[in-house]
């Protein structure tokens, strides 16, 4: 069965940014990929990010950068602008659409007691659906 | 077809406050940002904030904050954009458009808004 | 902000002439670029995305390129219906738009 694995990380030289990890275990190919933070988009969470393997991609702030770092998974670079987004209690999700698998999302978010540089386990949820 | 349907223009006097809306249709409301842009006459474009629809949202160009209030109502797939305490440089058409992976694909018709006493 | 400076506020030109406008960030916006085009009284229209995409439903006589902080909109056929202004705009970190360039007949 296929897997999605997040991983938030609080960057150690900067307190403010945060990067989420993402990554889909299974067969076939990739199509999109949708990042969402409060919960998964179209549940009441807000799009940050989307990533097309050969359109490029597409971010909204508080995103700064959405990357491919394999073929499937991805990073996405966010700037806590303070008080307004207070990403340290925020779930985060990601959701991998293949073919021809279909959807598969999961979230995760960064661990109450978590030091700079650490991050949550690469574990998926397995609590959220495949469509 | 997709649609952004604004509301019609709007002549006020200095000092108050007007609400625009852009009611949309032909596609998955929630799914989308709604983009507002300022262009006065003759001028460029402008950015005045963002609002995600499924979840409200909502992100401004610094410009415009506390000029400009955002916001949604999903039942009537209607955003709203209020802009407070106008004086004649907020004299401008407003448009609302769909900010999708594409950037801006679909763009309301605009609304004029006259700052004149 | 990232500024989007479009040097060229008026352009002249005749019909079936190829036309290049270009649009220069401030900072690196990788390919996060869209170009619209506006006629009076009209609303924008997207023509472009991720810098050199296509949008459905334009004509191929128009394409984008460039990356980073250099960009360039070509109308390699130009027509008359093409007369209008032309927008950069950047999506990279928040929106901001270029002045436009407004494209005349000579």
């Known amino acids: 069965t296929p897997e999605v694995w997040v991983q938030v990380q609080m960057e150690a030289t900067e307190l403010s940014s945060f990067t989420v990890h993402c990554g889909f275990l299974g067969p076939g190919s990739i199509s999109l990929v949708t990042v969402s933070w409060g919960g998964p988009d179209g549940a009441g969470g807000t799009k940050l990010a989307v990533l097309h393997p050969e359109l490029g991609t597409r971010q909204w702030a508080p995103a700064r950068q959405a990357r491919w770092e394999t073929q499937s998974s991805i990073s996405l670079a966010l700037e806590d602008s303070g008080a307004s987004s207070p990403f340290a209690n925020t779930t985060f999700c990601c959701k991998f659409a293949s073919f021809p698998e279909g959807s598969w999302e999961s979230c995760g978010s960064l661990p109450p007691s978590s030091d700079p540089g650490l991050s949550a386990p690469p574990t998926p949820v397995p609590i959220l659906r495949a469509d | 077809q997709i649609q952004l349907q604004q509301s019609g223009p709007e002549l006020v006097k200095p000092g108050a406050s007007v609400k625009i809306s852009c009611k949309a249709s032909?596609?998955?409301?929630?799914?989308?940002?709604i983009a507002w842009v300022k262009q006065r006459p003759g001028q460029g474009l402008e950015w005045i904030g963002w609002i995600y629809l499924g979840s409200g949202h909502t992100m401004y160009n610094e410009n415009f904050k506390g000029k400009a209030t955002l916001t949604v109502d999903t039942s009537s797939s209607t955003a709203y954009m209020q802009l407070s305490s106008l004086t004649s440089e907020d004299s401008a058409v407003y448009f609302c458009?769909?900010?999708?992976?594409?950037?801006?694909?679909?763009w309301g018709q605009g609304t004029s808004v006259t700052v004149s006493s | 902000d990232i500024v989007m400076t479009q040097s060229q506020k008026f352009m002249s030109t005749t019909v079936g002439d190829r036309v290049s406008i270009t649009c220069k960030a401030s900072q690196n916006v990788g390919t996060a670029v869209a170009w619209y085009q506006q006629k009076p009284g009209q609303s924008p229209k997207l023509l472009i995305y991720?810098?050199?995409n296509r949008y459905t439903g334009v004509p191929d006589r128009f394409t984008g390129s460039g990356s980073g902080t250099d960009f360039t909109l070509t109308i390699s056929n130009m027509q008359s219906e093409d007369l209008a202004d032309y927008f950069c705009?950047?999506?990279?970190?928040?929106?901001?738009f270029g002045a436009g360039t407004k494209l005349e007949l000579k």
């Open positions: 458009a769909r900010d999708s992976f594409y950037a801006m694909d679909y």
């Open positions: 991720s810098a050199s």
């Open positions: 705009q950047q999506y990279s970190t928040y929106l901001t």
């Open positions: 032909g596609y998955t409301f929630t799914d989308y940002y």
